[in-house]
Structures are given as C-alpha cells and as structure tokens.
C-alpha cells in the first residue's frame, strides 16, 4: 500500500515537474512574443505617426493645389473671353499674377539679390514693381506682408531711378524716417543702391546682394497674348 502511494506520489511529482517546465517554457515564449509585439507596436506607432504627418502635409498640399486650380481656371476663363471677344485690351493677368488697376503683379515666395530679381521679372516680360501711389503701396504691402521685398528703385548709376523710367523726383515716395541713407560703409563701393519694402511697408535702401523677396509688375492695358 505504502509503495503504491510512493509510486503515485513520484508520478505526480514528475507530472508537476513537467507541467512547471512546460509552463516556464510557455511563459518564456509568451514573454518573448510580448516583447516582439511591444517592439512591433512601437514600430507601427512610429510608422502611423509618420503616415499621419505625411497625410497632413499631403492634405495641405492638396488644398493649395485646389486653390491654385481655381485661380488658374478663373484666369483661363478670362483669357478665353478676351480671345472670343477679339479685343486688343488685356483685361486679365497671367496665371499666378494678381491684377490691380492697370497692372498685373507677381509676388515671389523665395529670396534673391536685387539684380537676379530684376532679371527674373524681365524674363517674365515685366520689371520690379514701380510704386506710383499710396493706394498701390497699400495693395503691395497687403500682399507681401511683413517681409523685406525688393522694388524697382535703384541708385546704382548715381541718382535714384525707377526701372521703367518713371520720374523719381516728382513721383510717390514712402521712405522710412532718415532713409535713404545711402550708407557707404558696406565696402562694396558706391552706396547701398537698392530699395525695398521693410516689414512695416516703409522703404529702405540696402545692399543689393541681400536675399529678399521681390515683386514683379507688368502693364495689362494691351493684349500680349498671355
């Protein structure tokens, strides 16, 4: 009787030992799997975060494209109306240009030195903006915002001159107090040479190599086929 009990006890011990070993192995496996799941989750979280960011950027980009598309559509409709009417008057501006009074304006987003900015405008059959009135000043100021922006005024050849030949002396001016100072201390020879809108819209003269935004202007009183 006693030896039978001992045999059963031994069998139970073995079963328990096997069960413990099996449980340990399962716990270890689960622990490893848990670690993997944790790592996988972290990886998925970071992927999801990146996808959300990309999606947010795509959404913003898409909105911009839609706005641009609407603007382009308006511009093309206008130009089609001009062509159908066979008129010689150009009442619309090129795509991406903004109309005001008798001119079309293009506002840069990037920055360039004054000579490069003027060259850019010329390639667009335009010139750096010539500000002729307080109304035009306010219109431009509204579009450029609080960022330095080149205008078509320079004294590189001596006296101050507008790029389109408009008379400077008798024309509109909006210099900041004590400007233009035509400061010679920049070591470039000659004065500061180029005029720009400052953050508050007042004009300042500065070194022409500064990388400021710029505004192009072209007349829209004649149809140039654009």
């Amino acid at each position: 009787q006693n030896s039978k009990l001992q045999e059963e006890l031994q069998a139970l011990r073995e079963t328990f030992s096997n069960l413990t070993a099996s449980t340990d192995a399962k716990v270890k496996t689960l622990s490893m799997q848990g670690g993997n799941v944790g790592r996988k989750m972290k990886s998925l979280e970071s992927q999801l975060e990146k996808q959300q960011q990309d999606l947010s950027e795509d959404h913003s980009s898409l909105l911009l494209h839609v706005k641009q598309f609407v603007s382009d559509l308006r511009s093309l409709s206008c130009q089609m109306a001009v062509l159908q009417g066979n008129g010689s008057e150009r009442t619309c501006c090129p795509v991406n240009w903004v109309g005001y009074e008798g001119s079309c304006y293009w506002f840069s987003r990037s920055g360039k030195p004054w000579p490069e900015a003027e060259k850019y405008c010329q390639l667009e059959n335009a010139h750096l903006v010539v500000v002729g009135s307080w109304e035009e000043q306010k219109f431009i100021q509204h579009h450029v915002g609080p960022v330095n922006s080149w205008i078509g005024l320079t004294d590189q050849s001596g006296p101050w001159k507008w790029v389109d030949g408009t008379d400077y002396e008798s024309g509109f001016k909006n210099w900041r107090p004590e400007q233009p100072d035509d400061w010679y201390g920049h070591g470039l020879g000659g004065g500061e040479d180029c005029a720009h809108f400052t953050e508050d819209g007042g004009w300042n003269d500065d070194i022409c190599q500064r990388p400021y935004r710029w505004v192009c202007e072209t007349q829209r009183d004649r149809d140039s086929g654009s």
């Epitope: 920055g111 960022v147 920049h186 070591g187 470039l188 070194i207 500064r210």
Partner: antibody
C-alpha cells in the same frame, strides 16, 4: 524660456539616410526662420541650410545640395533635416539655430546639438 | 561664396587682459556680421549681431566694430569664463559663411 532640442542623430553607414528633428519651445516658431549648422570633430562651424518662417524659401550649402532637405511643421513647432546619400564627411554634430528674423538675419538661439556618425 | 578670414587662429592671454580678434571678408558685407562664442562640448552662443549690437544678456565687456570687409571683436577685460573659441559669421547673403575660429587660451 526659448529652447531648441535636436534628436535623430546616430551611427549610419555611407549611402544610407537619417532624419534629424529639432523641437522648438518658448517662442512663436512660425514667425522665425530656422537653420541647420554642423561641426565636424575638431573643426569649425559650417552652415548647412536655412528655411524661412513659412517654409517658402530654402537654401543649402553646396556640400549638401541635392542630398539634404530642410523642412518644418509649424503646427508641431518642429524643424527637420532629411539627410540622404550620407558620406563620411557628413560626420558632425548638427545644431539647429533660430534666425533673428524670417530667414535672412543672424542666428541668435542654438540647440545643444545631435551627433551624426557616418561609418562603415 | 564669401570667404571669412579670422586672425589670430589662437592666442594666449591672462585674466584682465584686453583681447582683440579680427575678421576679414572677401567682399563687402555692410554690417551683416555676427560673433559667436563656443566652449568645448557646448553649442555656440550668440554674442553680437549687425557687427556691433549686443545680444540680450551678453555682458558689455564684449564689443564689436567695423563695416565693409574689416571687423573686430574686443573683450575689454578677460575673465576665466571667456576662455573659449570665437567665430565670426556673415549673413549678408547665402550661403552663410563662418570664419575659421580664434581659440583664446589661458597664458
């Protein structure tokens, strides 16, 4: 207080990519231009790239042009530098720095830097 | 690109000394010049901008002068915390460029 904290540095093999981040706090991030500047071990400072306050203008040093891309997310107050086709000579401490204005003025606030090591 | 030449590349000085570092540019940059201080293992710290304007919180012992192509940084009375490397940088146009640095060491 005004703070810039870089992250994302590490050891990477030549030809691989890495993306650095710079978290900004204590100021209105969306009104300032931001720059990346690097410093190779035992060397001087080298300007890498600038992005204007609104992301409209980006400029790069010739040494990274076509390989690195600077970007920003103003909603998250974060600046990024995506570095592709990395070379051994890109090994450096990378600092993000705030422009005093929209992007064409001097640097006034710097982060503590994050180290990038390009090695096989 | 605008080249920046700093001199000397290193100098030894004593506490209380007046120290002058010069920076020369390859073309005129007006006053679009900044000065930075960097201590070993630390990020650079902005000292001056527009050649002579002190950043807020920077002590008045630091001063800058110059315009065009020649600039100087002066520390009127050197203190132990001023031993560091100093860099000039032009921001007149892109790419921004730095001088090679001037290491100020204890004599």
């Amino acid at each position: 207080q005004v703070q810039l904290v870089e992250s994302g540095g590490g050891v990477v093999q030549p030809g691989r990519s890495l993306r650095l981040s710079c978290a900004a706090s204590g100021f209105t991030f969306s009104t300032y231009g931001m720059h990346w500047v690097r410093q190779a071990p035992g060397k001087g400072l080298e300007w890498v790239a600038v992005i204007w306050y609104d992301g409209s203008n980006k400029n790069y040093a010739d040494s990274v042009k076509g390989r690195f891309t600077i970007s920003r997310d103003n909603s998250k107050n974060t600046l990024y530098l995506q570095m592709n086709s990395l070379r051994a000579e890109d090994t450096a401490v990378y600092y993000c720095a705030r422009d005093q204005g929209v992007g064409y003025d001097g640097l006034d606030v710097w982060g503590q830097g994050t180290t990038v090591t390009v090695s096989s | 690109d605008i080249q920046m030449t700093q001199s000397p590349s290193s100098l030894s000085a004593s506490v209380g000394d007046r120290v002058t570092i010069t920076c020369r540019t390859s073309q005129g940059i007006g006053n679009y010049l900044a000065w930075f201080q960097q201590k070993p293992g630390k990020a650079p710290k902005s000292l001056l901008y527009k050649a002579s304007s002190l950043q807020s919180g920077v002590p008045s012992k630091f001063s800058g002068s110059g315009s065009g192509t020649d600039f100087t940084l002066t520390i009127s009375s050197l203190q132990p915390e001023d031993f560091a490397t100093y860099y000039c940088q032009q921001y007149m146009t892109y790419p921004l460029t730095f001088g090679g640095g001037t290491k100020v060491e204890i004599k």
